[in-house]
Interface confidence: low
């Protein structure tokens, strides 16, 4: 017991002696936050000059305060011991650690493209002032029907499946008996949906081709050379929405 007490006392003495020796050897260690160790003045602690700070003691220089200029606005003023903090002016929002960037806000129902805010295309929505337009939920994938149609600002609301809505159907639908695949209404509606989707795609690409012929090649090149940019659609002058192709939804197309 006495031995361990001796060890603790010895350690404390060593630490205290080290601290005293360190402060004798390095007077800068005595300089508190808000000051710096001034080599030009026999290493005395000088206050940080205006527009600078030191958040820790023993610093040989003060750091320049961050200036919230341009699209940035001051959230917290710089003090001698802490840096300024910025946020973004109205119409912009912060990005990055410590609000290192500001990005332009858009309205709900829009997304930010290379050149500004554009309306979400039909079939997509954005319920925030930032971020990209996302596709409406496909209710039929969960075997449900669309209860409330989607808008540019809101996703669709899925309701019970069409079968659940038939007269006399109980709220809990029992599993259907196995039937011949050829007779399943789900499969028939699936093939109908598939056919109409294919027709829509064909129509879309024919329209795209026509509009490219009309406007020249540059826009098409622009769409395909920027797989990650959410390109502005070719017919954007008419409907002013910013489209991504369905293949690009998952992060770009390889051409």
């Amino acid at each position: 017991m006495g031995n361990s007490c001796y060890n603790i006392v010895a350690t404390l003495l060593l630490v205290l002696n080290f601290e005293r020796t360190r402060s004798l050897q390095d007077p800068c260690s005595n300089c508190p936050a808000g000051t710096f160790c001034d080599n030009n003045r026999n290493q005395i602690c000088s206050p940080c000059p205006p527009n600078s700070f030191s958040s820790a003691g023993g610093q040989r220089t003060c750091d320049i305060c961050r200036q919230c200029k341009g699209v940035f606005r001051t959230r917290k003023e710089c003090s001698s011991t802490s840096n300024a903090e910025c946020d973004c002016t109205p119409g912009f929002h912060c990005l990055g650690a410590g609000c290192s960037m500001c990005e332009q806000d858009c309205k709900q129902g829009q997304e930010l493209t290379k050149k500004g805010c554009k309306d979400c295309c039909f079939g997509t929505f954005n319920d925030q002032k930032r971020g990209i337009c996302r596709p409406w939920t496909n209710c039929s994938l969960d075997g449900k029907s669309v209860l409330v149609n989607g808008t540019k600002e809101r996703d669709v609301v899925c309701g019970p499946s069409p079968a659940d809505l038939s007269p006399g159907a109980s709220s809990v639908t029992p599993p259907a008996p196995a039937r011949e695949p050829g007779h399943s209404p789900q499969i028939i509606s699936f093939f109908l949906a598939l056919t109409s989707t294919a027709l829509l795609f064909l129509l879309f690409f024919l329209t795209l081709r026509f509009s490219v012929v009309k406007r020249g090649r540059k826009k098409l090149l622009y769409i395909f050379k920027q797989p990650f940019m959410r390109p502005v659609q070719t017919t954007q002058e008419e409907d002013g929405c910013s489209c991504r192709f369905p293949e690009e939804e998952e992060g770009g197309c390889e051409l």
Epitope: V71, E103, K115, G116, K118, V232, G240
Partner: antibody, heavy 114, light 111 residues
Amino acid sequence: SLEESGGRLVTPGGSLTLTCTVSGFSLNNNAISWVRQAPGKGLEWVAIIQNTGTTDYARWAKGRFTISKTSTTVDLKINSPTTEDTATYFCGRGYGFESELVIWGPGTLVTVSS
Amino acid sequence: AAVLTQTPSSTSAAVGGTVTISCQSSQSVYNNNALAWYQKKPGQPPKLLIYLASTLASGVPSRFSGSGSGTQFTLTISDLECDDAATYYCLGVYNDDVDNGFGGGTEVVFK
């Protein structure tokens, strides 16, 4: 902040690369434009590089200039300078909108002369 | 390429007065509002005053205002101060097959 460098006296037909060094923000999220001003003339938009690396040039600048970037710098290469390229070159940072160049470097002077 | 025509090319003003600068584009700017106004002084980089045609940039006095849409835009500087002596430029952004570009500039000098 932004700072341009590389401006100097160069002979016509030589090659010159201007560098815009950025600090305090990421080029992964920001577009950088180059703009120039010849002595006694107005401002002229030269080129832009988007955060994705996509580039766009003024029509007159295509082929004459090449814009590229690393993680902290954006370079503008003047491929075969002529006396008309004598100007102060500025780089500017936009916020999601090309026309809105909020932060600028002080500029670097390029003189093309034989 | 679109042409941005600024008028007047030079204007003489009095302290406390008002100056109006016009910027006309030969084609509609992107989204009808992709136009910015800059102040340029010798030896200094341009300074953004107005963006999206009418939005005041941060730290810019409310004496500066922008208006217009499509092809016709205006910068108005009221209660002029000596420090406003500079050249003012509009910058238009266009669809992808048209160059972005500055107007020719308007020099504001004091009587």
